[in-house]
Amino acid sequence: SWMWNQFFLLEEYTGSDYQYVGKLHSDQDRGDGSLKYILSGDGAGDLFIINENTGDIQATKRLDREEKPVYILRAQAINRRTGRPVEPESEFIIKIHDINDNEPIFTKEVYTATVPEMSDVGTFVVQVTATDADDPTYGNSAKVVYSILQGQPYFSVESETGIIKTALLNMDRENREQYQVVIQAKDMGGQMGGLSGTTTVNITLTDVNDNPPRFPQSTYQFKTPESSPPGTPIGRIKASDADVGENAEIEYSITDGEGLDMFDVITDQETQEGIITVKKLLDFEKKKVYTLKVEASNPYVEPRFLYLGPFKDSATVRIVVEDVDEPPVFSKLAYILQIREDAQINTTIGSVTAQDPDAARNPVKYSVDRHTDMDRIFNIDSGNGSIFTSKLLDRETLLWHNITVIATEINNPKQSSRVPLYIKVLDVNDNAPEFAEFYETFVCEKAKADQLIQTLHAVDKDDPYSGHQFSFSLAPEAASGSNFTIQDNKDNTAGILTRKNGYNRHEMSTYLLPVVISDNDYPVQSSTGTVTVRVCACDHHGNMQSCHAEALIHPTGLSTGA
């Protein structure tokens, strides 16, 4: 059987000879060299060599336990002649003994940590960790103790855990933000002769809201022209806050003053400035100076710092309204006038009024914008703003005239205003009614008396207030002895009726009927229209079959016997 125990070897051997490990020996070995000892496994033939005759093992190189603490090898004892093993192949261990040859090494060369300013003493900041590659199971070579080399009295470190805590009350970021702390880790439980390593911890105090906003001045003055439209920025005010980030965010508001309704303040999120803007239209002539009380406050407040006072500040803002030479202002935004279409030239329609709103009350002259009245139908009295016609009107041509009137300051022609004028032309009965279309109809030869052969419609260009009322009749010259009659339907239509039984197209092929159409307005207007009636052969259903191609026309425009 094999005769050995576990082999132990001290690491980092510095002798000049190979380091002796131990002896492999089989009780079958007679000492005559008949056995051959063979080593295999971790480092065999390289780190570890064996005397194949004696079984003595030596280490050829300096070994480092931290690199490899245990080597597992296999031993064979073989009969040199036959190759026959005299023992079963066996595994054995070479264990490397530790020496304190490694200093503690921090997991980071530099740690960065943050802790809120004004933290209570003992507030956790960060935990640093150092590891020692030496054997933790043997001696104190890997027992690490932490201490602080730099960073007192602000911070402390727990010797066992490496936890860094705050050690000073009321550390103020606004006073000092950055701290560099140096921590030492020492092995051998911190005893003399222990190896040590250090790390740097860069600690930043993070901001808390422990400072209110402050205006650098108590009063601000801005000027703005009275013409500034709503939304116009007038000026910027800025309160400073020693804090940073959201703790330094400021909201501005107007809390008091006679300009409370006239101005707004908005917060510029980028610059943290308050922008004073116009809220309503200003009028120098009404009020020349406004005062506002503007407040700057932190939107996020930490209750534990309220004892330091309110987290807001206020300032007075004085706004001076500057006079602006303003254009004339019309009494209305638009004017609507009306005039009869039969008005004579120079008839006055109405008038416009404009005034200079400035204190100077400069006189104004009026004119028509000729781009809006190319035909020069209207004119204006430049002095008093009276509008009058300069040409005759026709409602039936144009119902509405849309023109623009200009008011200009006489002393400063650059200051002018414009106003729209809508002129409605009122109707006058100046058009006669007419047939709605050209009427040409036919009558069957075998037609019976009082038979309706055509319905007549009329149109009138006028637009009477109470609507059209037309009357129809045969012209006086055709009324007696006519072959047809006109029946007025009293609904603005009329019918042509036969007056006899039967017509002979060979005797009279065409009749021309003069019809008088009158309206019922003042003054009455009438016109005469002619209806052509052809005599045709029809079937028994009354459908036309044939007519003469042309009518015999009487020189007076009436057929004989119509």
Epitope: D32, K36, T82, G83, R84, P85, P88, E89
Partner: antibody
């Protein structure tokens, strides 16, 4: 390089003896056993015996125990195999071979011994 | 004596094909996980050459198409892809017990 050089061919009469030499070079002669193997014409290999050069310890196969003698001369790193009472069936090629853990890792070129009347 | 029986006596294999030679010992030649069985190649007019030792270990300088396996009494020599230069007689040998004995040999030829 390891070399085993054997003596030349021999023609012998039946009943006589033959001594074949094997000169070793390229390694420590006393660290390895030396074996002798023969091969009759057209036949297989037959192990005859071996010797430990450091102690002159020998092993012979039963078949040749009374007729074979294996010796060494450590000074010349030479091994010898002497076979006596030769018979026609001893006609063969005789090889020396270095032994290492039961295997023959180097062989001589062989010596032909012919036994004929 | 331990008798070594090789099979087959001869073997014809195409170039590039696998050749397998078996060797059976009359009793076990294994002890403590070591198999005292070795394989040799002999070409005409030349001494034998060691190919495989201790059943499966390839001798230095031998192509890796040769491999050995087995334990106790049954062992195999395999040529994974036969080459022209592999034409030879192959012998197995045991060193487990005196006298050391060889198999009768297997002649490998090209088909």
């Amino acid at each position: 390089e390891v070399q085993l050089v054997q003596s030349g061919a021999e023609v012998k009469k039946p009943g006589s003896s033959v001594k074949v030499s094997c000169k070793a070079s390229g390694y420590t002669f006393t660290n390895y056993w030396m074996h002798w193997v023969r091969q009759a014409p057209g036949q297989g290999l037959e192990w005859m015996g071996d010797i430990d050069p450091s102690h002159s310890e020998t092993h012979y196969t039963q078949k040749f125990k009374d007729r074979v003698t294996i010796t060494v001369d450590k000074s010349t790193s030479t091994a010898y195999m002497e076979l006596s009472s030769l018979r026609s069936e001893d006609t063969a090629v005789y090889y020396c071979a270095r032994g290492d853990l039961g295997r023959f890792d180097y062989w001589g070129q062989g010596t032909t011994v012919t036994v004929s009347s | 004596d331990i008798v070594m029986t090789q099979s087959p006596d001869s073997l014809a294999v195409s170039l590039g094909e696998r050749a397998t030679i078996n060797c059976r010992a009359s009793e076990s030649v294994s002890i403590h996980g070591t198999h005292l069985m070795h394989w040799y190649q002999q070409k005409p007019g030349q001494p034998p050459k060691l190919l495989i030792y201790a059943a499966s270990n390839l001798e230095s300088g031998v192509p890796d198409r040769f491999s050995g396996s087995g334990s106790e009494t049954d062992f195999t020599l395999t040529i994974s892809s036969l080459q022209a230069e592999d034409v030879a007689v192959y012998y197995c040998q045991q060193s487990f017990e005196d006298p050391w004995t060889f198999g009768g040999g297997t002649k490998v030829e090209i088909k």
